[in-house]
């Protein structure tokens, strides 16, 4: 999906209002220095591309993020403010259904969410630079 035509201001508002709080809740008990951020993003479409991939693509070490509250809200936000996004997400929905139901938060999932927080913060910063 090409995120170029999204309403970035609206996505930022949704992130600051709800998604960020859910991410921080997920990370509760860990310090921001506990994990080393190894990925970043260049501009707004790039940030959303990587956020989408990291949130919804299961990895061998962390298969369950797609079922988390922040992931559901991320999906709803992208569907709302990115034209045509919903139609491209049928496969992603299947992946969410296949994701493990276990609510155990592994260290690797915490690391992945730490990376997500970094990508979202970069998204906000690139938005501020453009204004």
């Amino acid at each position: 999906y090409d995120f170029t035509n999204c309403d970035f201001q609206k996505i930022e508002a949704d992130y600051l209002r709800t998604i960020s709080k859910d991410l921080i809740t997920y990370m509760s008990g860990t310090k921001s220095t506990d994990f080393n951020n190894t990925v970043s993003c260049s501009n707004r479409p790039h940030c959303l591309t990587e956020i989408q991939s990291l949130t919804f693509n299961p990895t061998p070490r962390c298969a369950s993020l797609a079922k988390e509250m922040f992931a559901r809200k991320t999906k709803a936000t992208l569907a709302l403010w990115c034209p045509g996004y919903s139609e491209t997400q049928i496969n992603a929905t299947q992946a969410m259904k296949k994701a493990r139901k276990s609510k155990v938060t592994t260290n690797k999932c915490l690391e992945q969410v730490s990376q997500l927080l970094g990508l979202w913060r970069r998204f906000i910063r690139t938005l501020l630079k453009k204004q």
Epitope: N36, N37, T38, V39, S40, C41, S42, N43, P45, H46, T49, E50, S53, L54, N57, T59, P60, R61, Q112, Q115, K129
Partner: antibody
């Protein structure tokens, strides 16, 4: 300390597919970062080809996108480049590199690929 | 596509002298710029990222400055091992990351 090593044929015929592999040691490619390909024609500058991130997202240089495929084999800690329909203009030293999806902090030593019949 | 123009193409200096290399972008890249050093037969090495942050293990004599369209790499006092080709790279314009054409720093 991460080390990267390119391997593959040094000579490819025009119109064929160039295939290279990068073997990574000292770091798991499924643990973090992105894993990129960059090339440098003899005596010229650098050109970014694309990357695959540790979680599987892929991004390509638009000028090469129609001909490029980057994939990975996490069990071997390798990632690969395929470039189809090559011409003499694709003759270059090909580098694999580790990236944070922005810039490139560790590089392989490079492998020269010549396109010639 | 953002074009990066490096100047001069060649810089002839003696060890101990100060080297000032320029990189100009065709449009603003904010501070999304990196510098690399490449010696003959070797891979490039990251020196500077985010326009002014030194990469791990890079000596303090290397410094970067600038923002927007004009950037400078300064080598305060050239060591014999610093004679090489230097490239700038912008990462503001995903998915079109581009490099400059390079500046060669040679011994006078």
């Amino acid at each position: 300390q991460v080390q990267l090593q390119e391997s593959g044929p040094g000579l490819v015929k025009p119109s064929e597919t160039l295939s290279l592999t990068c073997t990574v040691s000292g770091y798991s490619i499924s643990s973090g970062y992105g894993w990129s390909w960059i090339r440098q024609p003899p005596g010229k500058g650098l050109e970014w080809i694309g990357y695959i991130s540790y979680y599987g997202s892929i991004s390509y240089n638009p000028s090469l996108k129609s001909r490029v495929t980057i994939s990975r084999d996490t069990s071997k800690n390798q990632f690969s480049l395929k470039l189809s329909s090559v011409t003499a203009a694709d003759t270059a030293v090909y580098y694999c590199a580790r990236t944070n999806l922005l810039y490139f902090d560790s590089w392989g030593q490079g492998t020269l690929v010549t396109v010639s019949s | 596509e953002i074009v990066l123009t490096q100047s001069p193409a060649t810089l002839s200096l003696s060890p101990g002298e100060r080297a000032t290399l320029s990189c100009r972008a065709s449009q603003s890249v904010s501070n999304n710029l990196a510098w690399y050093q490449q010696k003959p037969g070797q891979a490039p090495r990251l020196l500077i990222y985010d326009a002014s942050s030194r990469a791990t293990g890079i000596p303090a004599r290397f410094s970067g400055s600038g923002s927007g369209t004009d950037f400078t790499l300064t080598i305060s006092s050239l060591e014999p091992e610093d004679f090489a080709v230097y490239y700038c790279q912008q990462y503001s314009d995903w998915p079109q990351y581009t490099f400059g054409q390079g500046t060669k720093v040679e011994i006078k």
